[in-house]
């Protein structure tokens, strides 16, 4: 097909951020057009020669992908009618941080828009009381981070008080020698109050609670993308 | 500020070889894709080489492959380009030019080729 | 190959619109990018992805795309923008259209 008149599409990605062997998604968005066959997606990766990913007549075309993508990607085809030109990412890697293109051709003209992927690797804390030790402490472990996450303690009593004096923090590295484990161990713990043992680096930031009283011990957690926006 | 220095050119017989060098700076070297564009007197733009930020990737035009070679060194900030077996029509203006996407975003001065016997 | 087609040169009196086209094969589906070049100097981007103009680039730099042409018009021409003209594409490598000596009269 051909583009016969010059029209710009709205095209809309989301900065986004992948956990290292794992899935990931980079976000695009694009006004849609009513014939699939009409439509190409290219994703572009700044850096790279090759393509990230191409579809094009309603399948991957991928006779220009690059190396390093190699059965690692796949749009959501039946979604692509609709405006979703959203790429899978398959075992994240390191080095698949940087700034991409997503490019998008229809009936109605092109468009583009660019989207940072930052990678590392993020995990939930479970914060436990160590019965093991010869005072009342607790024990925050995530199992996977990376880059070197900063550990802060904090507690819902003693509201701004500075727990590094009380705690002790240690990161060691995993099997595959890039992602580490944190452990942190709070000393020194008082009864009838909440801890929160908050770990943090430029990709995510995440929260292990821990509620302890006489008669039970309640525990939350959660984990937050940093710096995700449009 | 962005600059790219080309330097290496100069006379040389057909048969020889020459590598010419491209010192990069202002930017993240190893995020960007790099290329080699020449310009024989009087003549128009011919892409040359194109190598990955990471060097890995490298397109070569037709009329220069099994000849030349593309690399960098990334902990130095230079790309390279070696030339093998030049041959008159090889005579020109090299530059190296920063890829963009599917452009090319700066460019440096140039590094004259001469290939005479 | 994909190839592109510039005429070899185009006039135009200072103050007037100068218009440069760029033929190719649906042109209109691929990204197009305009280099001036003056003489003994390096290219210069002066129009990136169709329209898109550099920061430093004067607003009187504008390009489009669309069928089987892009192009590249200068508005208001001034004597300083003689110079030749290249049109550009990615096909699996750098493709520079054949180029148009912009003459100032």
């Known amino acids: 097909f051909g583009i016969s008149g010059r029209h710009s599409i709205t095209v809309t990605t989301v900065a986004s951020a992948g956990n290292i062997g794992e899935d990931g998604i980079l976000s695009c968005t694009f006004e849609p057009d009513i014939k699939l066959s009409d439509i190409v997606i290219q994703w572009l990766k700044e850096g790279v020669l090759g393509l990230v990913h191409e579809f094009k007549e309603g399948k991957d075309e991928l006779s220009e992908q690059d190396e390093m993508f190699r059965g690692r990607t796949a749009v959501f085809a039946d979604q692509v009618i609709v405006g979703n030109a959203s790429l899978r990412l398959k075992n994240v890697q390191l080095t698949d941080a940087g700034t991409y293109k997503c490019y998008i051709i229809t009936s109605k003209g092109k468009g583009n828009a660019n989207l940072e992927y930052k990678t590392g690797a993020f995990s939930m804390p479970e914060v436990n009381v160590d019965y093991n030790a010869s005072s009342e402490t607790l024990r925050c472990e995530a199992p996977r981070w990376f880059p070197q996450p900063t550990v802060v303690w904090a507690s819902q009593v003693d509201q701004g008080a500075n727990f590094s004096e009380v705690s002790n923090t240690s990161f060691e590295l995993n099997s595959e020698n890039v992602t580490m484990k944190v452990v942190s161990v709070l000393y020194n713990v008082t009864i009838n109050n909440t801890y929160s043992c908050m770990i943090e680096n430029d990709i995510a930031k995440a929260t292990g609670d821990i509620k302890v009283t006489e008669s039970e011990i309640k525990r939350r957690s959660h984990l937050q993308l940093l710096n995700s926006k449009a | 500020e962005v600059q790219l220095v080309e330097s290496g050119g100069g006379v040389v017989q057909p048969g020889r070889s020459l590598r010419l060098s491209c010192a990069a700076s202002g930017f993240t070297f190893t995020s960007r894709a790099m290329n080699w564009v020449r310009q024989a007197p009087g003549k128009g733009l011919e892409w040359v080489s194109a190598?990955?930020?990471?060097?890995?990737?490298?397109y070569y035009a037709d009329s220069v492959k099994g000849r030349f070679t593309i690399s960098r060194d990334n902990s130095k900030n230079t790309l390279y380009l070696q030339m093998n077996s030049l041959r008159a029509e090889d005579t020109a203006v090299y530059y190296c030019?920063?890829?963009?996407?599917?452009?090319?975003?700066?460019w440096g001065q140039g590094t004259t080729v001469t290939v005479s016997s | 190959s994909y190839e592109l087609t510039q005429p070899p040169s185009v006039s135009v009196a200072p103050g007037k619109t100068a218009r440069i086209t760029c033929g190719g094969n649906n042109i209109g589906s691929k990204s197009v990018h305009w280099y001036q070049q003056k003489p003994g100097q390096a290219p210069v981007l002066v129009v990136y992805d169709d329209s898109d103009r550099p920061s430093g680039i004067p607003e009187r730099f504008s390009g489009s795309n669309s069928g089987n042409t892009a192009t590249l018009t200068i508005s208001r021409v001034e004597a300083g923008d003689e110079a030749d003209y290249y049109c550009q594409v990615w096909d699996r490598g750098m493709i520079f259209g054949t180029g148009t000596k912009l003459t100032v009269l």
């Open positions: 190598i990955s930020g990471s060097g890995a990737t490298a």
């Open positions: 030019a920063r890829k963009r996407w599917y452009g090319m975003d700066v």
